[in-house]
Amino acid sequence: KSSSEATNITPKHNMKAFLDELKAENIKKFLHNFTQIPHLAGTEQNFQLAKQIQSQWKEFGLDSVELTHYDVLLSYPNKTHPNYISIINEDGNEIFNTSLFEPPPAGYENVSDIVPPFSAFSPQGMPEGDLVYVNYARTEDFFKLERDMKINCSGKIVIARYGKVFRGNKVKNAQLAGATGVILYSDPADYFAPGVKSYPDGWNLPGGGVQRGNILNLNGAGDPLTPGYPANEYAYRRGIAEAVGLPSIPVHPIGYYDAQKLLEKMGGSASPDSSWRGSLKVPYNVGPGFTGNFSTQKVKMHIHSTSEVTRIYNVIGTLRGAVEPDRYVILGGHRDSWVFGGIDPQSGAAVVHEIVRSFGTLKKEGWRPRRTILFASWDAEEFGLLGSTEWAEENSRLLQERGVAYINADSSIEGNYTLRVDCTPLMYSLVYNLTKELESPDEGFEGKSLYESWTKKSPSPEFSGMPRISKLGSGNDFEVFFQRLGIASGRARYTKNWETNKFSSYPLYHSVYETYELVEKFYDPMFKYHLTVAQVRGGMVFELANSVVLPFDCRDYAVVLRKYADKIYNISMKHPQEMKTYSVSFDSLFSAVKNFTEIASKFSERLRDFDKSNPILLRMMNDQLMFLERAFIDPLGLPDRPFYRHVIYAPSSHNKYAGESFPGIYDALFDIESKVDPSQAWGEVKRQISIATFTVQAAAETLSEVA
């Protein structure tokens, strides 16, 4: 087919036609279908769902839909030897045991294969000892304990409340502090919003509800046994002792009823301040150990989970591009859930399904996108982003040459207050322009744009009159595409009001109570927020795949680079004397940022003025835009994190969920006053400044006039 023949872009087949085809009722139906039984990674049920999705995507009209499988390390509780935690008396008798399962919600009592709460990849073990309460187990919590309160966690079992940071970071911090085990619990202060009933009468966490989750510290590695390479049939696998990111101490999660029993007996030091106290009727003493009358009692963990190499399945659907079939726009979200996945992931998977259906409808009418669109249903996201990472490892050479953009599609909702977007600065203008064209679903904003309600409810902290867009961190399937491969990425979902709802995530996250009914009764009865998210995600994909000139604005990268350079310089200037002593200068970085700003503006002028009808010129300019994100990749990666290679953004070393800017410099400066060898530490700061400078300058040069 000639390119002119293939495009078929008529006024009938435009963005409006695509958006109009999206229906809330379909999303509701798909969500119901995806949430009737558990779809745990590595199980037969999740394989069957993969085959169902493959079949339906074919019916919807995609050109091809394939299953790709990998054999990766997963982790499951031992069915005959359950995990639990005890309080034992001086004779070793168990006088209290935590529950072995969550009471299933009404109507689900007879569902089989509900995995009991566990911390995936916990090693086996039965440590016993005194308890220390470590608040959220953040870096700063351990600083407070060890440095200010002089409390030693070595040989102790620590109990930490969920929230604020990724659970894997909590476990890593506890290990470094010398703990022999970790108990994670959900405190009502973080998972019970005032004035709301607990499930099934509301969306709050009941006392027996527990958050599952993996506790890995993979740093982008994918399958722990095959870092850097796909876990296929001929892959070399490391021994378990050499596996990446596995915790070394037993870990187990509990609900707040069980936590009450452990925390009410705590003695030792009082909590340092109110930020360490939750909402349970317990003293929140730090310990170590129990108070006077109970001081001879200890805590014992009984963890018997096993890690095993298990087959997982991704579903990859292709809608071939008419003009640039070798340019890929990817929409991906995971399919595996901890239990029913009412929100995570199926509220996202249902939206992807409807987006595929809408694109398929247009395709059946003779339309094709300009560029190829790839749709992905990832497996084993909950076990460390394994499906997406293995697929990207297998296809890395294609992706780094052809990948235009990746749009993530996990949970569509984590609340019903306003939009939440995290993306590369290249997509800021795309997101703003799109949301100005979409109708707000919010009450009180009838007839107003999504942009307007979003700006009102979630204003940018720096730039007035604009909505907040956050940095990409990790904890979801965009990680390998953005942080490792440097493919422009973004994500969007509906969120809670962060001002009034201080709890972390949504209360029923990763619990058995995350059901279809939770969504349909309490979060989005009309599925209007799901529809809006479908319009945002789908609209972004449509524009990225169909715009003649890629909808990326490099000027917005210039703006944030200036902001990030200012921020890191201000952090560094908390040490003016050392800056002088070790001749640390940010002049080169500021110069590179200025050069980037200048070149980006000149590029934008050329982009506006060039002859769009010249296919060679068009391809050349689009390639410069596509490869700009790639130019921020350092092939050597960040220190000790070889798969985090983006120099401008990385997941925070202290919280995988959060993004950090100029992470190499940031980490080199972090807690630098405590380093044993200040000369070496400041030398590393200088090295990181030089890497950042080179990278920004090199990226700028990719935007320079080619000849």
Partner: antibody, heavy 121, light 111 residues
Framework: EVQLVESGGGLVQPGGSLRLSCAAS????????MSWVRQAPGKGLEWVSA????????YYADSVKGRFTISRDNSKNTLWLQMNSLRAEDTAVYYC??????????????WGQGTLVTVSS | QSVLTQPPSVSAAPGQKVTISCSGS????????VSWYQQLPGTAPKLLIY???KRPSGIPDRFSGSKSGTSATLGITGLQTGDEADYYC???????????FGGGTKLTVLG
């Protein structure tokens, strides 16, 4: 040839509002940060606000934060400054200035002729 | 009170050399580029020096700029009566996320 022409100044009572405009020509307006700089009678230059190229991120001096709003329309090559809750100390000549480097403010290579704003009862 | 400090006035005879200082801090002049502006009576400011020491086309080489640490200096040699004007230094402040100016220096050419 680059031209910046301000308009919209005038006499206004304390607490009142005024909207200044700056019509730009002779350069790719959308690619450059634009600023408003003011000069009270007999006094020095005071930067008021800037708006970036691209999506139009905004920056304000503390003295006007929450009262003034800068905006731009790239399709019309126009910059605006909406001034609310005006005070006597806002009396000044307001200049529109173009950044020389690009999307964020570095230094100003072109200035308008200025428009006088007088806040008085 | 301006963030950057300049002397209120300087004066010198025609043909002489004059320098105008501009003092700031690590968050502005210390890390960012300094520019200088000339404002002739009754006119809009005009860019004189950018990037600490560069001259836009059309600005004679009698005007020079330098920066050291947290201070910057504008030098004018071969003073002419037409140089009588107010001179302002300016830069970005990385802590304030704002453009900052000096209070201005009135140059009088004696004679």
């Amino acid at each position: 040839e680059v031209q910046l022409v301000e308009s919209g100044g005038g006499l206004v009572q304390p607490g009142g509002s005024l909207r200044l405009s700056c019509a730009a020509s002779g350069f790719t307006f959308s690619s450059y940060a634009m600023s408003w700089v003011r000069q009270a009678p007999g006094k020095g230059l005071e930067w008021v606000s800037a708006i970036s190229g691209g999506i139009g991120s905004t920056y304000y001096a503390d003295s006007v934060k929450g009262r003034f709003t800068i905006s731009r329309d790239n399709s019309k090559n126009t910059l605006w400054l909406q001034m609310n809750s005006l005070r006597a100390e806002d009396t000044a000549v307001y200049y529109c200035a173009k950044d020389a480097v690009g999307a964020t403010p570095y230094y100003f290579d072109y200035w308008g002729q200025g428009t006088l704003v007088t806040v008085s009862s | 009170q301006s963030v950057l400090t300049q002397p209120p006035s300087v004066s010198a005879a025609p043909g002489q050399k004059v320098t105008i200082s501009c003092s700031g801090s690590s968050s502005n002049i210390g890390i960012n580029y300094v520019s200088w502006y000339q404002q002739l009576p009754g006119t809009a400011p005009k860019l004189l020096i950018y990037d600490n020491n560069k001259r836009p086309s059309g600005i004679p080489d009698r005007f020079s700029g330098s920066k050291s640490g947290t201070s910057a200096t504008l030098g004018i040699t071969g003073l002419q009566t037409g140089d009588e004007a107010d001179y302002y230094c300016g830069t970005w402040d990385s802590s304030l996320s704002a453009v900052v100016f000096g209070g201005g220096t009135k140059l009088t050419v004696l004679g």
